[in-house]
């Protein structure tokens, strides 16, 4: 019989008492085969974290700073359930730490030195740890003691709870630095008042502070937010302009064997019986003998944290950077205007080898990081382990939802001004063998299908989006008799045709021979009835252009396109017979790396781009033996995006809507995790 007990960790007598009451009340409402609670008492949250890591307890609820401690080795805990605030219809699990300024003050984030600052309190998240952590490497040396460095950075501050004797500048704007509401500039509202009164130039608070203090929109319009990219935005655009997005209060558990499903089952049932306004006898979110015992009194319920989400992703790059800076206190030798090497994310061995070759030839400008899937790469770029990669439009969508931005687009047509002219896109097509003459767009049911990969544009999002509109369900593996769609569940019929050996079967990388455009076409040649690819795929792999044994004798004339009106056309008539126009592949990065990635890639393509005439004697960025490694092989250049610099603008309304419609069919665990952070 599996043990269905969750050992909850309590950090005080009062918490232990509430925990026992929680245990007893759960017993009375949950059947004997359901989850149960046991209580473990420890002296502190850090002791609880250690106890969970050592398998002496299973769960505890923590503030963001402690979630960071819990994630660090050797603890390796992960977030499993989040408390939410507000309503069930619009649950808030995060708040945003922001820097508020008056509209008429003309400075940006990188010009804060010498300004006057208002903080909620020393050591508090939004008011101190996050802003000072992010500014840490700009502080004058020596950076220890921190208070002295901060005092020397700003021209005056109000940082309640600071030592006014040792650091008088930190109390210059609020004499005495009182650590309670007796100090008019204490806390969120106090720090905002410090700005409003004109005492300070910037207030470090949370996004809701300004709304709680200024009910009138006209009054709010006198203020702006400072963004990390050295721009400003209106105060209601905090989701796109903040210092960090911070989880409010989170249940953590072990990463391996952590009982996360059981913990969720327990808390979900607990909120049903003892949540807000559920029971008089016992209330989960109430603390008669104290404050915020086990859970925050202000919580309204729980949400399950998506399983793909580790602590780094949950806390977010900015928060982790801020806290790491404060804890580790390490900065580059001397901050220079020079760009650090760009860490390129490479998929599997083939891409890594090409990336390493690029790295050697780039003379230190490019470094390489490996991952097994595109989603793993996106996650690495999000958390700073990698910086950039080039992505198909379907993954540009996922990356965009995860906060990354497109920075350059692949262009596939030769033109005089390639780098300045991003193209409209390429065509997604459905290819069949000419010999299968009865096959049309209208009778594909039961046929064998070949896809570049799940989640990619031409191979999946466009054809499956069109198919979904027709069949109104997501069971594509039942629509086709079998197929190869790398990235599908291994037991799906859409992995049956794949050719990868062992664990590589149906993997969405080059270890699966039927992966990508060339792979999907090969799947059609060898096993399938229809391949969903780009309009250039057939000509690029026929007429001797691909020397591989399976392709070298293929003839373009032996293949035709399926048109949406039920007719068929020759391959060269793609402009009048395609499924949709697809946005070109694009390079994505984090917002903070945008300028450097842009600069270094422009340099790199001038050295190794299509101006290189002899690829047998020189490194060529846009060529690869096993097809489309790092970039599409037909890339002519990487083009500026001009104003199409967000994923929505880059992909276009129509494509974003199409992928959005297909979201209900999505199996992307990363997309689920990212939409948890930003619904």
């Amino acid at each position: 019989v599996p043990d269905k007990t969750v050992r909850w960790c309590a950090v005080s007598e009062h918490e232990a008492t509430k925990c026992q009451s929680f245990r007893d009340h759960m017993k009375s409402v949950i059947p004997s085969d359901g989850p149960s609670v046991a209580c473990v008492k420890k002296a502190s949250y850090l002791d609880c974290i250690r106890a969970i890591a050592a398998n002496e307890a299973d769960a505890v609820t923590l503030d963001a700073g402690l979630v960071y401690d819990a994630y660090l080795a050797p603890n390796n805990l992960k977030p499993v359930v989040a408390e939410f605030y507000g309503s069930k219809e619009d649950p808030q699990t995060f708040y945003y730490a922001v820097a508020v300024v008056k509209k008429d003050s003309g400075f940006q984030m990188n010009q804060l030195r010498g300004k006057k600052s208002c903080h909620t309190g020393l050591g508090r998240s939004a008011g101190w740890n996050i802003p000072i952590g992010l500014l840490y490497c700009d502080l004058p040396e020596p950076r220890k003691p921190l208070e002295k460095a901060v005092a020397n950075f700003f021209s005056g501050s109000c940082a309640p709870c600071a030592d006014g004797t040792d650091f008088p500048q930190l109390c210059q704007l609020c004499p005495g630095c009182g650590c309670s509401t007796l100090n008019q500039y204490f806390g969120y509202s106090g720090a905002f008042k410090c700005l409003k009164d004109g005492a300070g130039d910037v207030a470090f608070v949370k996004h809701s502070t300004i709304f709680e203090n200024l009910a009138n929109k006209a009054d709010r319009d006198q203020y702006e937010l400072l963004c990390l990219d050295n721009t400003r935005k209106p105060v209601d655009e905090y989701k796109d302009c903040h210092l960090a997005q911070v989880p409010s209060h989170t249940v953590v558990a072990r990463s391996m064997g952590g009982k996360e499903d059981l913990i969720w089952e327990l808390l979900n049932q607990a909120q049903e019986h003892f949540g807000k306004d559920k029971s008089k006898e016992f209330q989960l979110f109430s603390s008669p003998h104290g404050k915020d015992l086990l859970f925050k009194d202000s919580a309204h319920g729980f949400l399950k944290v998506p399983p793909r989400m580790d602590a780094k992703m949950y806390l977010g790059y900015e928060y982790v950077t801020a806290i790491r800076n404060l804890r580790e206190g390490t900065c580059p030798e001397a901050p220079t205007d020079e760009c650090k090497p760009v860490k390129w994310c490479a998929l599997s061995h083939h891409e890594r080898l090409k990336c390493d070759e690029w790295s050697v030839n780039s003379v230190g400008k490019i470094e390489c990081v490996s991952a097994e899937t595109t989603e793993d790469c996106i996650a690495k770029i999000m958390n700073g382990e990698a910086d950039a990669m080039s992505l198909d439009g379907g993954f540009v969508y996922i990356a965009g939802k995860c906060g990354l931005v497109p920075v350059l687009a692949e262009n596939y047509n030769k033109s005089d001004n390639c780098e300045d002219t991003p193209e409209a896109g390429y065509f997604a097509i459905a290819v069949v063998k000419k010999s299968a003459s009865d096959l049309t767009w209208d009778n594909l049911k039961g046929k064998k299908s070949c896809h570049t990969a799940v989640g990619r544009t031409a191979g999946w999002n466009i054809p499956m989006g069109l198919l979904y509109n027709k069949i109104n369900h997501c069971r594509f593996d039942e629509f086709f008799s079998e197929g190869c769609a790398p990235g599908s569940k291994k037991d799906s019929s859409l992995c049956k045709l794949c050719m990868g050996s062992g664990l590589n079967l149906c993997e969405p990388n080059n270890k699966e021979g039927y992966y990508g455009y060339t792979g999907a076409f090969r799947c059609l040649v060898e096993k399938g009835d229809v391949a969903f690819v780009k309009h250039q795929t057939v000509p690029q792999n026929t007429g001797g252009k691909n020397p591989d044994p399976w392709a070298k004798n293929l003839n373009e004339k032996d293949y035709e396109l399926l048109c949406l009106d039920g007719t068929r056309k020759p391959v060269e008539e793609y402009a009048n017979c395609h499924l949709a126009r697809a946005p070109n592949h694009a390079v994505v990065t984090r917002k903070d790396k945008e300028a450097c990635v842009h600069k270094i890639l422009r340099q790199q393509q001038h050295l190794f781009g299509s101006n290189v005439t002899d690829c047998s004697g020189n490194f060529c960025l846009f060529r690869s033996e096993t097809k489309d490694l790092l970039f599409r092989d037909d890339t002519v250049c990487l083009a500026k995006l001009h104003d199409r610099n967000t994923y929505e603008k880059y992909l276009g309304e129509e494509y974003v809507k199409a992928v959005g419609n297909l979201r209900k069919c999505s199996t992307s665990s990363l997309l689920e995790a990212c939409t948890f952070r930003r619904p």
């Epitope: 390493d356 790295s359 050697v360 030839n361 003379v363 230190g364």
Partner: nanobody, 112 residues
Framework: QVQLVESGGGLVQPGGSLRLSCVAS????????VIWYRQAPGKQRELVAL???????NYRESVKGRFTISRDDAKNTVWLQMNALEPEDTGVYYC??????FGQGTQVTVSS
Amino acid sequence: QVQLVESGGGLVQPGGSLRLSCVASGSGFGINGVIWYRQAPGKQRELVALIKSDGYTNYRESVKGRFTISRDDAKNTVWLQMNALEPEDTGVYYCKTPGVPFGQGTQVTVSS
């Protein structure tokens, strides 16, 4: 001007071993890494192995576990130890570092 000279090639039976060396004249050799390539008759030149300045190495899939690349900066030399040689390993082997043209290469023939 740095020049690269490859040596150590020869005729060897399948299963045999060879050790290729790449010696550079001049200073600053291999500061950004060194790559061994090979070219079989009528085929494209292909990357075999590389070693970066920090000692990181990588290999094409077909030679992994059989070939080992190493370096001795004091001697301005990079080696390619090739074991369990197969007929498909036949070709001219070249070493390369950024900014330096290809040398003459050294011929490796694996045949019984």
